[in-house]
């Protein structure tokens, strides 16, 4: 229903704490370079204004849309053009064009230093002195680095962060308590960031219909006992919520998400038997718990999918009368029977089924034509199954770091034009799929692997779109979202690439590498590996192994030397010479 004052309505629904957190996230995602202090000042102004509107909905400006109010605030920032250049041009536009303009200027790879976690004592001191400010900084730092992070979920992670600090800051060994717990929150949040970016990409590039199809498949897998009408309702709501968050309507998004959680908990009987534990939790945890809920048990008496979608003589009539609904029903029926498939695979099968009906229903004898459609699914199912098998075997053989290196070599050969930092980031993330998915039971591996890879490849596409350098990457990224992963998997060595000339400085290292944390050391080595492949794209696995082994020994030796600098200076050139020879 319409409210006189949108901002008053959201403030009342969300409560002051969540309202302020969401406004801070919104501003941090739009203006990613502004310091925390500047944003928090704006947040306070907006909050004070919202309170005046709660007191009197007819007060001046209370009837304005939230986009108008937020946009006016952002555009009033002094020196906006100095700091943001052409983003300031957005301020000359009217809503809704102004908001669209802000969205287009979101930077997926902002030039910000990696978020450094302070050491335990310092963290606990600042948390205990001012928890609100500490958590505000967390929201700000994550939101500005991830401008599409799902806002209500980020509030949830801030709450988790708060819990960990509250618990660990009273311990004697704070670091031992904090490190693993915060690492776990960080890992989950980073995965959440790439997954949500994929959802926003889907929405931006292919519209609501594509996103809704994704939602139908996902919900059907999770809630196989729910009727199609119920799944459709849930998918429609989830699509609306995600559209709002991807579009910067964070208050409405969070409010609608809470509403959906309430609806699901009030209608457990028609949705799933697994919801009760989630429904006892407070709002943020409830929504998060529902989003991560385990699959309900598949009904025992499901008939063969062929009955309604191949054998029924009215297939073409039914399809012609309501194509999207008929295909939606197919997707629902297939997905609820296959929690062991990835959503990407299920959508590829639905697409194949649609193409088959489009072709066959226009022919003379449709049943004869579409009669074999389910058998034709087999190669589509086998391809990702083989991908999972070969990659998990490789991961088990090499471990995470070795597997990342294998992926890095593979992807540098596929797209050597892509910048080394982007390739290293992508390979490290793709390589984590092993740890994340290969240890799971067989039935969970495929959905875990393929849907995670799809999200990581979407990140690669988003970064590549900013500065396109590889025709092959552009081709895979331009196609349908569900075909991306197979497209990348099918890429081979780029024969058109002219190898990079060998630059000694690329492979020159200094003693500072010795004091780096393990992760940074790995990145240095992986950067060198990518550069080697760019120099010799057709180097054999053995050649690369030799050079990298030699390199690891060199670093190890010099870091143990009494005079480290001297060791790096004298041994370095020898290493470079040996490497050139090994790759000749």
């Amino acid at each position: 229903e319409a409210h006189k004052s949108e901002i008053a309505h959201r403030f009342k629904d969300l409560g002051e704490q969540h309202f302020k957190g969401l406004v801070l996230i919104a501003f941090s995602q739009y203006l990613q370079k502004c310091p925390y202090e500047e944003h928090i000042k704006l947040v306070q102004e907006v909050t004070d204004f919202a309170k005046t509107c709660v007191a009197d909905e007819n007060a001046e400006n209370c009837d304005k849309s939230i986009h108008t109010l937020f946009g006016d605030k952002l555009c009033a920032i002094p020196k906006l053009r100095d700091n943001y250049g052409e983003l300031a041009d957005c301020c000359a536009k009217q809503e809704p064009e102004r908001n669209e303009c802000f969205l287009q200027h979101k930077d997926d790879n902002p030039n910000l230093p990696p978020f450094q976690r302070p050491e335990a004592e310092a963290m606990c001191t600042s948390f205990q002195e001012n928890p609100t400010s500490f958590l505000g900084h967390y929201l700000h730092e994550v939101a500005r680095r991830h401008p599409y992070f799902y806002a209500p979920e980020l509030l949830y992670y801030a709450e988790k962060y708060n819990e960990v600090l509250t618990q660990c800051c009273t311990e004697s060994d704070k670091a031992a308590c904090l490190t693993p717990k915060l690492d776990a929150v960080k890992e989950k949040a980073l995965v959440a960031a790439v997954r949500q970016r994929m959802k926003c990409s889907s929405m931006q590039r292919f519209g609501e219909r594509a996103f809704k199809a994704w939602a139908v498949a996902r919900m059907s897998q999770r809630f196989p006992n729910a009727e199609f009408a119920e799944i459709t309702k849930l998918a429609t709501d989830v699509t609306k919520i995600n559209k709002e968050c991807c579009h910067g309507d964070l208050l409405e998004c969070a409010d609608d998400r809470a509403e959906l959680a309430k609806y699901m908990c009030e209608n457990q009987a028609t949705i799933s038997s697994k919801l009760q534990a989630c429904c006892d939790k407070p709002v943020l945890q409830k929504s998060q718990c529902l989003a991560e809920i385990e699959h309900d048990n598949i009904p025992a008496d499901l008939p063969s999918i062929a009955a309604d979608f191949v054998e029924d003589k009215e297939v073409c009539k039914n399809y012609a009368e309501a194509k999207d609904v008929f295909l939606g029903t197919f997707l629902y029926e297939y997905s609820r029977r296959h929690p062991d498939y990835s959503v990407s695979l299920l959508l590829r099968l639905a697409k194949k089924y649609e193409a088959t009906l489009e072709k066959c229903c226009a022919e003379g004898d449709p049943p004869a034509c579409y009669g074999t459609v389910l058998a034709e699914f087999q190669p589509l199912v086998e391809e990702p199954k083989n991908l999972v098998k070969t990659n998990c075997e490789l991961y088990e053989k090499l471990g995470e770091y070795g597997f990342q290196n294998a992926v890095l070599v593979r992807y540098t050969q596929k797209a050597p034009q892509v910048s080394t930092p982007t390739l290293v980031e992508a390979a490290r993330n793709l390589g984590r799929v092993g740890t994340k998915c290969c240890t799971l039971p067989e039935a969970q591996r495929l959905p875990c692997v393929e849907d995670y890879l799809s999200a990581i490849l979407n990140r690669l596409c988003v970064l590549h779109e900013k500065t396109p350098v590889s025709e092959k990457v552009t081709k895979c990224c331009s196609g349908s979202l569900v075909e991306r992963r197979p497209c990348f998997s099918a890429l081979t060595v780029d024969e058109t690439y002219v190898p990079k000339e060998f630059k000694a400085e690329t492979f020159t290292f200094h003693s500072d590498i010795c004091t780096l944390p393990d992760k940074e050391k790995q990145i240095k080595k992986q950067t060198a590996l990518a550069e080697l492949v760019k120099h010799k794209p057709k180097a054999t696995e053995d050649q690369l192994k030799t050079v990298m082994g030699d390199f690891a020994q060199f670093v190890d030796k010099c870091c143990k030397a009494a005079d480290k600098d001297n060791c790096f200076a004298t041994e370095g050139p020898n290493l470079v010479a040996r490497s050139k020879e090994a790759l000749a």
Epitope: A320, A322, V325, C361
Partner: nanobody, 123 residues
Framework: QVQLQESGGGLVQPGGSLRLSCAAS????????MVWVRQATGKGLEWVST????????RYADSVNGRFTISRDNAENTLYLLMNSLKPEDTAVYYC????????????????RGQGTQVTVSS
Amino acid sequence: QVQLQESGGGLVQPGGSLRLSCAASGFAFSTSGMVWVRQATGKGLEWVSTISDDSRIIRYADSVNGRFTISRDNAENTLYLLMNSLKPEDTAVYYCATYRAGSRIGSYEDYYRGQGTQVTVSS
């Protein structure tokens, strides 16, 4: 809101022809499948013919196949049914219909329908 207005019915002798039209508004006609159904006095709704959004897929009930032709003009938001070699058993009220969200496909009582146009085949 969805509006469907049939026209073109009338009294015709057996073996004669009629062309029914259906003017559609209030929904995305060019992306919607369309249906003709009919109802003889004292009987239930009977499906006659279906045409897909892009006219590529066309289906007829066995009782009218070879005699009736369904077509559409997406530019004019109009559905047609050309009826040749009419028989007394074709006498009925003819409705054009389209799928209503939330209904079951093929459950024509739940589809959006117009007021209907009467076709009477008699000598």
